[in-house]
Interface confidence: low
């Protein structure tokens, strides 16, 4: 088992909104849960955008999940990752 590296980034979307993207890479096996949570509760599927779980050429995998949030509310959102029985949460950088 190889645990993922998780990286959260933010980018400007429309005025007053930002897109936050959570990327997991370098993990094995491919089974992973990656999702955005607001106040500790998973966002609905229709408010998140997922990348496919894809091989990265090193025998490991990579994927991402993104959502759009209101600027100023970043502290309410975390990226939740679960892989091979281990889990972690990752905040949005300020």
């Amino acid at each position: 088992t190889v645990p993922p590296m998780v990286n959260v980034t933010r980018s400007e979307a429309s005025e007053g909104n930002i897109t936050v993207t959570c990327r997991a890479s370098g993990f094995y096996p491919w089974n992973i849960t990656l999702s955005w949570r607001q106040d500790g509760v998973s966002l609905s599927h229709d408010t998140q955008q997922w990348g496919d779980v894809l091989p990265d050429g090193n025998g490991t995998y990579q994927t991402w999940v993104a959502t759009r949030i209101c600027q100023g509310e970043e502290q309410r959102f975390t990226c939740y990752m679960e892989h091979s029985g281990n889990h972690s949460t990752h905040p949005v950088p300020s």
Epitope: R23, W30, Q49, D56, G59
Partner: antibody, heavy 118, light 108 residues
Framework: EVQLVQSGAEVKKPGASVKVSCKAS????????IYWVRQAPGQGLEWIGY????????IYNQQFKDRVTITADTSTSTAYLELSSLRSEDTAVYYC???????????WGQGTLVTVSS | EIVLTQSPATLSLSPGERATLSCSAS???????LHWYQQKPGQAPRLLIY???NLASGIPARFSGSGSGTDFTLTISSLEPEDFAVYYC?????????FGQGTKVEIK
């Protein structure tokens, strides 16, 4: 309805370059990768590479890495495949395809025939 | 690179017969990353079965898939005239993504 519409057939001389377009509609363009695959006459399918339009990541089949450029324009929901230094063995139908789950190819363009002939 | 070998190269059968197509991988593949496509002359391939055994949208139930590890099978329980085509397996578990060389199902 998901649709991938490719540009028309091309005839090129050896050593030239060709650029094939693939316009996507019926879904959020940045939600799925665009794969490129080619099929030589009477032959099987060969994966060239893919682009993830959302984060701009591009991964190539090493066999094509030196001669292929894959790009995407999210403003027009269009992906492009450019192949340079063409040779006769590049004569093939080039397909774009949308990525489905677990790296499959769930929707396909109609194909673009590229003929390389002197 | 994972090499997929399909057998037989050609399968000659009559409508109503059962077709069994094999796909053998040079290395073990997670069943979640093995897919099947159908291609008719002059047309683009279309996704038939994904993740070894799941029917793609609009694909009739006479198609089924099974297998694990290195050996996978596509079965057509009773061939219809429109099923005569070339079938490809594909793996998405490691780069480069690869296809089998195809099995042509032709009318006997």
């Amino acid at each position: 309805e998901v649709q991938l519409v490719q540009s028309g057939a091309e005839v090129k001389k050896p050593g030239a370059s060709v650029k094939v377009s693939c316009k996507a509609s019926g879904y959020a363009f940045t939600s799925n990768n665009i794969y490129w695959v080619r099929q030589a006459p009477g032959q099987g399918l060969e994966w060239i590479g893919y682009i993830d339009p959302y984060i701009g990541r591009i991964i190539y089949n090493q066999q094509f890495k030196d001669r292929v450029t894959i790009t995407a324009d999210t403003s027009t929901s269009t992906a492009y495949l450019e192949l340079s230094s063409l040779r006769s063995e590049d004569t093939a139908v080039y397909y774009c395809s949308r990525s489905g789950e677990r790296s499959n190819f769930d929707y396909w363009g109609q194909g673009t025939l590229v003929t390389v002939s002197s | 690179e994972i090499v997929l070998t399909q057998s037989p190269a050609t399968l000659s059968l009559s409508p109503g017969e059962r077709a069994t197509l094999s796909c053998s991988a040079s290395s073990s593949i997670s069943s979640n990353y093995l897919h099947w496509y159908q291609q008719k002359p002059g047309q683009a391939p279309r996704l038939l079965i994904y993740r070894t055994s799941n029917l793609a949208s609009g694909i009739p139930a006479r198609f089924s898939g099974s297998g694990s590890g290195t050996d996978f099978t596509l079965t057509i329980s009773s061939l219809e005239p429109e099923d005569f085509a070339v079938y490809y397996c594909q793996q998405g578990g490691s780069l480069p993504l690869t296809f089998g060389q195809g099995t042509k199902v032709e009318i006997k």
